[in-house]
Structures are given as structure tokens and as C-alpha cells.
């Protein structure tokens, strides 16, 4: 092992555990983590007599380094006396010494909170000729504290006579002020208020913040939703600017097209957020044909608080196309929620990631607020998937027990949509293509070709799936078969996944 100097710790008792009539008391010093032997421990007992005992060094199991304890027993007026333990480790260097000065016992205390406040800029957002830093040391058990100001870690020569202490109930607070020239403050140095109390150090630091920019303005430009593009046939794109600091300067958003052709009239909205920042959105209608043919649209953002203009561009996603597979299923009844049921829709393996998901009931599209749909996530392969969740009520399914999950995607043919119906009570459902969920089986229609079920939405079932005859203990209509997986070594009725 290489040479290692010791860490030194004072060992004291709690004051409340020492009897008031005690004539002598023992305190200690721990030197640990050093290598090689030896360390030399000496004590400064001031005006008091004391006897010392240094215990033999022990080896720390994991590191192979050493630890030792030196004990000092003093008698007399020890309560007001400070003691210094001096540890020397000559293998580290001939003058290596660590001193720890402490009293016989430690009192329970509430440590201070240290916080630096700084004077504000003038009305124009500029720094005044001098900057005041105020160090607030608050909420500590009354006792001696020392305040030191540091500049980039170096002690500053500061008049601390201005520090003032107040007491509120059982706790005390102190404040100290530091005045800096504008030049010092702008030089980007770090200023620290360091407080020493009960042998511990507490501190807070500050420096000039980055210039008057907010927390990084961000700009985003969305593509039109497939629903707007293919169903409503009135696509729009939105330029979103977030985290702007509200100020007199306005955000300037300018739209353009890479082809140089004119753009439509855009609509703009500004919103003040709870965190005090401003969000600006500008929505631009685009031509369906222009978009499909690959036009690039650009949104240029300028603002007094932005170092440079930001430009965001958007165009039709390039790359391979794949239509979505859609699977819809109902969750089983849950104890205590007989009048509500959750429907789920898994839409997967589509490319590109732009997709719109809708739910329909009674041929009417349900409001978007009714369902919750995840953002597209990448599958293990090259496509994307989303989940959509819809809560339905008994009143709805008793009126008509058929809910449709519809995906709108550019690769879906013939009309850019794929949809699947799902029922809360599949046994009572009508005959449209459905993917139903039983407690541990998937139901398939019996109208199969070459012994294969017409699984969810006509997709090919898992190669190891087949449709077995309906079981007597399965309360379904006779025209439904049970799709089971032929898993080796398992009963043929075990279902372990969507077929």
C-alpha cells in the first residue's frame, strides 16, 4: 500500500450525559486511514493536568491501513476549557500535522441555514455601479459564529463589524453584507459566505448569472397530424416557443417555404405560464398537396432575449413506410367498478411515427379528451407503437356495445385508416372484426381459412397458434372458437400471448 496520511476526528460525549458533579472527564482523538505506522498524538491541555493513553493501532480490514485512538482524562475546571489534539505522521512528510481543537463535550444544537441574497439590477436590467451581497445566517441555537467572505476560495479582507445578530425565541439569526464593485462582480468570480459554528462549517456561494437570457428558450415546429391531413384535409403546423422571459420585447415569428412560394395567414397565441415564463404559438395552415409533395416549411423566431435568430423547419418524414397493426381489447370487470370498464388499443409496427388515434362509439367520434394515448415509442424492430386507453360507462355499452379504435396513418390503405372494434361483453357482441380479451384466452372468429383463425383485424396469427373447438366451460356463443398456443409440454389450452 502507498503512503496515506490520517484523517483525524475528535471524540466527545454529549454534555447532557456528563454528571454535573463529575470531577474528571475523558475525551479522545481518532486517527484513521493512515499508512504506514506510526502516528504521534500529543495533547495541549492548557492550564489543566491530564493523563493520556494512546491505544495500539488496529488494522482496517479492507484497506490494510491503520487506525488508533488517543484518550485524554482531565480533572478540575474542564467545562470551560478547550483542548487540542495534535496528530503527526512523519511517513507522509516530516512536517505533516493535523490539529483538532474542541471542548470536552458536545451540546445539542440547531445548525444555521446560510443563504446569500444579492441586490437586483436596475430597471433596464443592467448592473448598478456596486452590488450588495447579503449573507443570512438563520435559525441556529445561540452561540459563537464566525463569518468569512471568500472570493474564488480566497479569504477577503472585509469589515465584519456590520454583521448584526437578532434572536427570535430560542433561535438566533445573523446577517453580514458585502459590497462589490461592478467590475469585480462582472469578472465572473464566485463569492462564498462561510460560517463556522460549533466546529462545523456551513456556506453558500453565488456568482453573476449568465447574461439576461431566460433558462434557454426552446422552439419547436410540429408536423400536421394525420387526422388533419387525411380526414379533415385541412392540415396545420404549429411553431411553439417556450421559456421566454416576459419583457417589453415581443417575439417575432416569421413563416416561409423553402420553395419561396407565399405562405397562408397564421394565427398566434401567447400564454403566461405558472412559472412566470411566456409561451408563444403560431399556427399555419398548409396545403395538403404541398405537404404530401414534400414542401419544407420554416418558422424563424427572434426576440430581444435570444442571442441569435432561431429557425425551425419541418417537412414530410422520409424513409420507409409501414401500415399500423391495430389490436383492441377490453379489460375484465374489476371488483368495485362494475359500471366502468377500460378499453385498450395497441397500435404497432408503423412507420413513420406520425399517427392519429381516435375512438368511436355509435359511429360518432369521441372527444380527444376522453382517451389517453402515449407518444410513439420505437419497437425492437424499426417501427413504432402507441397505446390508447378509453374508459367507458355501463350506460354507453348498454346503449351499444361496440367501440372502435381507429388509427390514421399515411401508410394505411386504402383510406389512411385502420380500425378495430371491441366490446365490453364479447359474448354478446355483433359480428364485426374484433380482437377480444378473455381472462386467459384470445377469442377468434370461426370463419378461418385452411384451419387458421381470422385473428385481430385479419393479421396472421402466431405460427404456433391454432383454433380449437369451443370449450364447454367457456360461456361463449357456439360460433366462437378459442385460439390457443401449442406450447411444448403444456396443456393445449394455455394461452401465453396475443396470437
Amino acid at each position: 500500500a502507498s503512503t496515506q496520511s490520517p484523517s483525524v476526528f475528535p471524540l466527545t460525549r454529549c454534555c447532557k450525559n456528563i454528571p454535573s458533579n463529575a470531577t474528571s472527564v475523558t475525551l479522545g482523538c481518532l486517527a484513521t486511514g493512515y499508512f504506514p505506522e506510526p502516528v504521534m498524538v500529543t495533547w495541549d491541555t492548557g492550564s489543566l493536568n491530564g493523563t493520556t493513553m494512546t491505544l495500539p493501532a488496529t488494522t482496517l480490514t479492507l484497506s490494510g491501513h491503520y487506525a488508533t485512538i488517543s484518550l485524554l482524562t482531565v480533572s478540575g475546571a474542564w467545562a470551560k476549557q478547550m483542548f487540542t489534539c495534535r496528530v503527526a505522521h512523519t511517513p507522509s512528510s516530516t512536517d505533516w500535522v493535523d490539529n483538532k481543537t474542541f471542548s470536552v463535550c458536545s451540546r445539542d444544537f440547531t445548525p444555521p441555514t446560510v443563504k446569500i441574497l444579492q441586490s437586483s439590477c436596475d430597471g433596464g436590467g443592467h448592473f448598478p455601479p456596486t452590488i450588495q451581497l447579503l449573507c443570512l445566517v438563520s435559525g441556529y441555537t445561540p452561540g459563537t459564529i464566525n463569518i468569512t467572505w471568500l472570493e474564488d476560495g480566497q479569504v477577503m479582507d472585509v469589515d465584519l463589524s456590520t454583521a448584526s445578530t437578532t434572536q427570535e425565541g430560542e433561535l438566533a439569526s445573523t446577517q453580514s453584507e458585502l459590497t462589490l464593485s461592478q467590475k469585480h462582480w462582472l469578472s465572473d468570480r464566485t463569492y462564498t459566505c462561510q460560517v463556522t459554528y460549533q466546529g462545523h462549517t456551513f456556506e453558500d456561494s453565488t456568482k453573476k448569472c449568465a447574461d439576461s437570457n431566460p433558462r434557454g428558450v426552446s422552439a419547436y415546429l410540429s408536423r400536421p397530424s394525420p387526422f388533419d391531413l387525411f380526414i379533415r384535409k385541412s392540415p396545420t403546423i404549429t411553431c411553439l416557443v417556450v421559456d421566454l422571459a416576459p419583457s417589453k420585447g415581443t417575439v417575432n415569428l416569421t413563416w416561409s417555404r423553402a420553395s419561396g412560394k407565399p405562405v397562408n395567414h397564421s394565427t398566434r397565441k401567447e400564454e403566461k405560464q405558472r412559472n412566470g415564463t411566456l409561451t408563444v404559438t403560431s399556427t399555419l395552415p398548409v396545403g395538403t398537396r404541398d405537404w404530401i409533395e414534400g414542401e419544407t416549411y420554416q418558422c424563424r423566431v427572434t426576440h430581444p432575449h435570444l442571442p441569435r435568430a432561431l429557425m425551425r423547419s419541418t417537412t414530410k418524414t422520409s424513409g420507409p413506410r409501414a401500415a399500423p397493426e391495430v389490436y383492441a381489447f377490453a379489460t375484465p370487470e374489476w371488483p368495485g367498478s362494475r359500471d366502468k370498464r377500460t378499453l385498450a388499443c395497441l397500435i404497432q409496427n408503423f412507420m413513420p411515427e406520425d399517427i392519429s388515434v381516435q375512438w368511436l362509439h355509435n359511429e360518432v367520434q369521441l372527444p380527444d379528451a376522453r382517451h389517453s394515448t402515449t407518444q410513439p415509442r420505437k419497437t425492437k424492430g424499426s417501427g413504432f407503437f402507441v397505446f390508447s386507453r378509453l374508459e367507458v360507462t355501463r350506460a354507453e355499452w348498454e346503449q351499444k356495445d361496440e367501440f372502435i379504435c381507429r388509427a390514421v396513418h399515411e401508410a394505411a390503405s386504402p383510406s389512411q385508416t385502420v380500425q378495430r372494434a371491441v366490446s365490453v361483453n364479447p359474448g354478446l357482441a355483433g359480428g364485426s372484426a374484433q380482437s377480444q380479451r378473455a381472462p386467459d384466452r384470445v377469442l377468434c372468429h370461426s370463419g378461418q381459412q385452411q384451419g387458421l383463425p381470422r385473428a385481430a383485424g385479419g393479421s396472421v396469427p402466431h405460427p404456433r397458434c391454432h383454433c380449437g373447438a369451443g370449450r364447454a366451460d367457456w360461456p361463449g356463443p357456439p360460433e366462437l372458437d378459442v385460439c390457443v398456443e401449442e406450447a411444448e409440454g403444456e396443456a393445449p389450452w394455455t394461452w401465453t400471448g396475443l396470437c
Epitope: A210, G249, R300, P304, L306, P307, R308, R312
Partner: antibody, heavy 119, light 110 residues
């Protein structure tokens, strides 16, 4: 065509000051954010400061306090004032124009002016 | 502040070689990554902006790619006039940034 011509460089003693100028022509200066970039001999490019079209400015952390960027659109000129010069400020200082549409980097650079700080 | 790390710092190649230079951002950036070419005694010249769009007059053998934190500049078939130093730049910072340039990659003749 777009032209940026820097001037004001030269030999200066440590602790001294310099004011670099950048004369712009061939485009409307007020439409562009402008940047100063420096390059020490044999070293890479180092961003110094930027001033946007509104006249607000930003500096690299190390440049705060000693460097001041400004612009006078009526004179088609951008300035960089450097105070308390140090040996490590020795570099070629380039005046550069940000692309108009933004987010796309610097499309035009001046030839640069050499600042040498030495006693 | 976002830091841009370029690698390698230098590369030796022959005319006709395919050369790829990478630039890594310390955090994800939107798309405003630019690439510059600089020859001795000259100012830098913009090659690529928006991480993949060729600047006017730049030969098609130069191409840019990448997203998020990883970006690359590729020269498909190195020409004699391509021996130079190349820099990437985070050109889209909407806030204070300390050094927006990568450290540079010198492409030398093998």
C-alpha cells in the same frame, strides 16, 4: 457581395486596451446577428461574443467583464472593445455574420485582425 | 453550457479515401449543427448547416448526418483541396454557451 473587414488589431502591452472594428458591406447589417470569434496561433476557434439584431449582447464566460461588443447600424460597423489585455488574448479576431434565417451558423467571415499582447 | 467534442483530432488519408469526422454534444441539440472548413491563413468557410444541408457552392462529396448528441461529417472521396481543418459548431443555442465550436479535426495527406 458580402464583405466584412476587421481593423484595430496590433501589438499591445499587457494591461492595455484595444477597440476592434468590423466594417460590413454588401448586406443590411441590421438584419443580422453578429459574432466575434477568435483563434490563437495554432489553436481552434473560440466564440467570444454575439450581438443580436436588437442590440443585446452575450459573452463567453471567460470574456465577461473585459470584452464589450457593440454595433452601429447607421455606420455599418460592429465593435469589440477589449480591456486589461493579457498574453492569452493573443489571437486572430474574426468578425462574422450569422445566417439571416437563424440556427444555421456563420455564413460570412472577415479575414481577421491579429492582436498580439506582449511586453 | 453545451460542450462540443470532436474526434479524431487529426486524420491521415489519401486522395479518394472516405473520411468521417464526428462531433458529440454534451446534451441533445435540436438540429442547428454547422460544419466549417479552414485552410491555413484563411477564415473558416461554412460547409453544412442544419446538420445535413449543404451550403451554397459546396461539393456533394460532403455530407452531414446525425441527431440528438451525435453528428458526423463525411467526405465520400477525398480531393486534394479537402486537406484542411474541420470544425463543428452548435449553431442553435438559444441561450448563453461558452464555446460553441468543437476542437477541430485536421485532415492531412498520408
Amino acid at each position: 457581395q458580402v464583405q466584412l473587414v476587421e481593423s484595430g488589431g496590433g501589438l499591445v502591452q499587457p494591461g492595455g486596451s484595444l477597440r476592434l472594428s468590423c466594417a460590413a458591406s454588401g448586406f443590411t447589417l441590421s438584419n443580422h446577428d453578429m459574432t466575434w470569434v477568435r483563434q490563437a496561433p495554432g489553436k481552434g476557434l473560440e466564440y467570444v461574443s454575439i450581438i443580436n439584431t436588437y442590440g443585446n449582447h452575450w459573452y463567453a464566460n471567460w470574456a465577461s467583464g473585459r470584452f464589450t461588443i457593440s454595433r452601429d447600424n447607421s455606420k455599418n460597423t460592429v465593435y469589440l472593445q477589449i480591456d486589461s489585455l493579457r498574453a492569452e488574448d493573443t489571437a486572430t479576431y474574426y468578425c462574422a455574420r450569422e445566417t439571416h434565417h437563424g440556427s444555421s451558423g456563420i455564413d460570412h467571415w472577415g479575414q481577421g485582425t491579429l492582436v498580439t499582447v506582449s511586453s | 453550457d453545451i460542450q462540443m467534442t470532436q474526434s479524431p483530432s487529426s486524420v491521415s488519408a489519401s486522395v479518394g479515401d472516405r473520411v468521417t469526422i464526428t462531433c458529440q454534444a454534451s446534451e441533445s441539440i435540436y438540429s442547428g449543427l454547422a460544419w466549417y472548413q479552414q485552410k491555413p491563413g484563411q477564415p473558416p468557410k461554412l460547409l453544412i448547416y442544419d446538420h445535413r444541408t449543404l451550403a451554397r457552392g459546396v461539393p456533394s462529396r460532403f455530407s452531414g448526418s446525425g441527431s440528438g448528441t451525435e453528428y458526423a461529417l463525411t467526405i465520400s472521396s477525398l480531393q486534394p483541396e479537402d486537406f484542411a481543418t474541420y470544425y463543428c459548431q452548435h449553431a442553435d443555442y438559444a441561450h448563453h454557451s461558452d464555446n460553441v465550436f468543437g476542437g477541430g479535426t485536421k485532415v492531412e495527406i498520408k
